[in-house]
Interface confidence: medium
């Protein structure tokens, strides 16, 4: 899960595999102030999971979420 510092969530590690796409309802990018670039996926149960924006599956999920 992202770590919040002064209300700015940052990620220090990425999830190791894709969650099923159906479990993800939304996403956001962490701030440019964070040391690691990251996408935060929010699951249907409101769990926040840090993901590596360079991974192909992450980009595909973002495209899918944008279209839905």
């Amino acid at each position: 899960s992202p770590y919040s510092s002064d209300t700015t969530p940052c990620c220090f590690a990425y999830i190791a595999r894709p969650l099923p796409r159906a479990h993800i309802k939304e996403y956001f990018y962490t701030s440019g102030k964070c040391s690691n670039p990251a996408v935060v996926f929010v699951t249907r149960k409101n769990r926040q999971v840090c993901a590596n924006p360079e991974k192909k599956w992450v980009r595909e999920y973002i495209n899918s979420l944008e279209m839905s």
């Epitope: 990425y14 190791a16 595999r17 894709p18 969650l19 099923p20 796409r21 699951t43 991974k55």
Partner: antibody
Framework: QVQLVQSGAEVEKPGASVKVSCRVS????????IHWVRQAPGKGLEWMGS????????IYAQRFQGRVTMTEETSANTAYMELSSLRSEDTAVYFC????????????????WGRGTLVTVSS | NFMLTQPHSVSESPGKTVTISCTGS????????VQWYRQRPGSAPSTVIY?????PSGVPDRISGSIDSSSNSASLTISGLTTEDEADYYC??????????FGGGTKLTVL
């Protein structure tokens, strides 16, 4: 340290069902997916499906759809795999394996496997 | 459907180096992490490489993993071979819905 303890060997007749259990210690079931993998004698590893914590529901490999049911009893931290309409080709060792579903990359993420349960289907 | 293909068997002499390939088809192998398992007869698989190139504690550094995006393949390399390395080796990854995918396995014989 996560550990998995599977139920003992089973011998079943064709057409019957078998239910294999997998008790998890050292990690809550609500945080991990439990995958089921089988290995027929002299063959490779075959993924059957998994029970996902997000929805508390299973996803199955297409070839087992309709014949396999994966469930969990969270109070007992135990996962189950039931395979029905058994045939001789289902004779195999059935493994459960953990998948720390939400975990970040790093050594805490690695899968842990049970020792396997031999299921023999014979008339 | 994403698939992983391995050679059925490889053999090499003690002390030498062997590389086992795992080629992806129907998708990019670099989309997700690759694991490698060693399985000795009568035992459950055990992890020798996780997350493409990471070694669990207890696995010697003569065992290494790598990914080559240009050939869409992963490789497991074992140097300084001993008879202890004789086993079946499986590569493993995921498709886009967290379904596990295994290679067919490679039998390593140390001559």
């Amino acid at each position: 340290q996560v550990q998995l303890v599977q139920s003992g060997a089973e011998v079943e007749k064709p057409g019957a069902s078998v239910k294999v259990s997998c008790r998890v210690s050292g990690y809550p079931l609500t945080e991990i997916a439990i995958h089921w993998v089988r290995q027929a004698p002299g063959k490779g590893l075959e993924w059957m499906g998994s029970f996902e914590p997000e929805d508390a529901e299973a996803i199955y490999a297409q070839r087992f759809q309709g014949r396999v049911t994966m469930t969990e009893e969270t109070s007992a931290n135990t996962a189950y795999m039931e395979l029905s309409s058994l045939r001789s080709e289902d004779t195999a060792v059935y493994f459960c394996a953990t998948d720390p579903y939400y975990a970040s990359s790093g050594s805490n993420y690695m899968e842990v496997w049970g020792r396997g349960t031999l299921v023999t289907v014979s008339s | 459907n994403f698939m992983l293909t391995q050679p059925h068997s490889v053999s090499e002499s003690p002390g030498k180096t062997v590389t086992i390939s795992c080629t992806g088809s129907g998708g990019s192998i670099s989309s997700n992490y690759v694991q490698w398992y060693r399985q000795r007869p009568g035992s459950a698989p055990s992890t020798v490489i996780y997350e493409d190139d990471q070694r669990p504690s207890g696995v010697p550094d003569r065992i290494s993993g790598s990914i080559d995006s240009s050939s869409n393949s992963a490789s497991l390399t074992i140097s300084g071979l001993t008879t202890e390395d004789e086993a079946d080796y499986y590569c493993h990854s995921y498709d886009g819905n967290n379904r596990w995918v295994f290679g067919g396995g490679t039998k390593l014989t140390v001559l």
